[in-house]
């Protein structure tokens, strides 16, 4: 029920991630740490360096009060999961300073991956027989 | 905007292999999941497949010996093939993008495609 | 499979009503629904998702409620062009399951 919850959090996510995607110009043109094919089993601990990254407005123009509405959105914690526990425990994830810094627009894709990775295999993990690759 | 469009023969013989594909325009094919969807004439709708930007899939188990789904980047395009249809498999043939893994947020408007001798 | 089951299969309303459509799972799905809106001919149109998450770009008359296995679609105020088949999908566990549609026509 709790990875359920924390899982379709993830999927509203993906939207507000989508609607960055729209103001990327108007996002300050910061390099930030931004995982990419993460291991398994690290996908909590990527996501908190996805929600720990400084995704900032450049305070431009008339989009500025959605942007921080937005990036607010996207830093809200969700309650910890025995899977994020356990995983804060691996001390072999890489930390997010050892990430690849890119700039926003890449950023929010990879931002997105992930969290599409971390549905998947929930969705996967409730079935049995439709996996193909 | 992301926008679909089916391309394919209308009309298959039985026996044969259906063939689509689904061009994406106003978007990259190089995120998210890509999926057929298809809707016999009366009839509601049924999951076939997806594939994901990687090239993973996933497919409905009552047609998985049948189809494949695959992706081509380069053209910002993906593919459905369905072999050895009969009758049954007569319907409308909708391409759509889950960008939320689980849900379709964009639809082509579909294609019919008849099986028939 | 997990199999929906939307009800009414059709309802005749006219423009101003307030129109509920229910869809009920086989098993617990949590909030894992979608609702798609269809017109003949045209692409279908995402609705809502997880239940209540209503999607970028569609009206606010249109709300999705429930979890486990009861859900509602609510049109709070039928406009003409909401004239359409409304389906339902799970979205809980592979194979991904429509429900069977319902109907919105003018009364």
């Known amino acids: 029920q709790g990875q359920d919850r924390h899982m379709i959090r993830m999927r509203q996510l993906i939207d507000i991630v989508d609607q960055l995607k729209n103001y990327v110009n108007d996002l300050v043109p910061e390099f930030l740490p931004a995982p990419e094919d993460v291991e398994t089993n690290c996908e909590w601990s990527a996501f908190s360096c996805f929600q720990k990254a400084q995704l900032k407005s450049a305070n431009t123009g008339n989009n500025e009060r959605i942007i921080n509405v937005s990036i607010k959105k996207l830093k809200r914690k969700p309650p910890s999961t025995n899977a994020g526990r356990r995983q804060k425990h691996r001390l072999t994830c890489p930390s997010c300073d050892s990430y690849e810094k890119k700039p926003p627009k890449e950023f929010l894709e990879r931002f997105k991956s992930l969290l599409q990775k971390m549905i998947h295999q929930h969705l996967s993990s409730r079935t049995h027989g439709s996996e193909d690759s | 905007q992301v926008q679909l469009q089916e391309s394919g023969p209308g009309l298959v013989k039985p026996s044969e292999t259906l063939s689509l594909t689904c061009t994406v325009s106003?978007?990259?094919?190089?995120?998210?999941?890509w999926g057929w969807i298809r809707q016999p004439p009366g009839k509601g709708l049924e999951w076939i497949g997806y594939i994901s930007s990687s090239g993973s899939t996933n497919y409905n188990p009552s047609l998985k010996s049948r189809v494949t789904i695959s992706v081509d980047t380069s053209r910002n395009q993906f593919s459905l093939k369905l072999s050895s249809v009969t009758a049954a498999d007569t319907a409308v043939y909708y391409c759509a993008r889950s960008a939320g893994v689980a849900d379709f947020d964009a639809w082509g408007q579909g294609t019919l495609v008849t099986v028939s001798s | 499979d997990i199999q929906l089951t939307q009800s009414p299969s059709s309802v005749s309303a006219s423009v101003g009503d307030r129109v509920t459509i229910t869809c009920r799972a086989s098993q617990g799905i949590s909030s894992w629904l979608a609702w798609y809106q269809h017109k003949p001919g045209k692409a279908p149109k995402l609705l809502i998702y997880?239940?209540?998450s209503l999607q970028s770009g569609v009206p606010s008359r249109f709300s999705g409620s429930g979890s486990g296995t009861d859900f509602t679609l609510t049109i709070s105020s039928l406009q003409p062009e909401d004239f359409a088949t409304y389906y339902c999908q799970q979205a809980s566990s592979f194979p991904l399951t429509f429900g069977g549609g319902t109907k919105v026509e003018i009364k």
């Open positions: 997880v239940a209540s």
């Open positions: 106003g978007g990259s094919i190089s995120s998210d999941y």
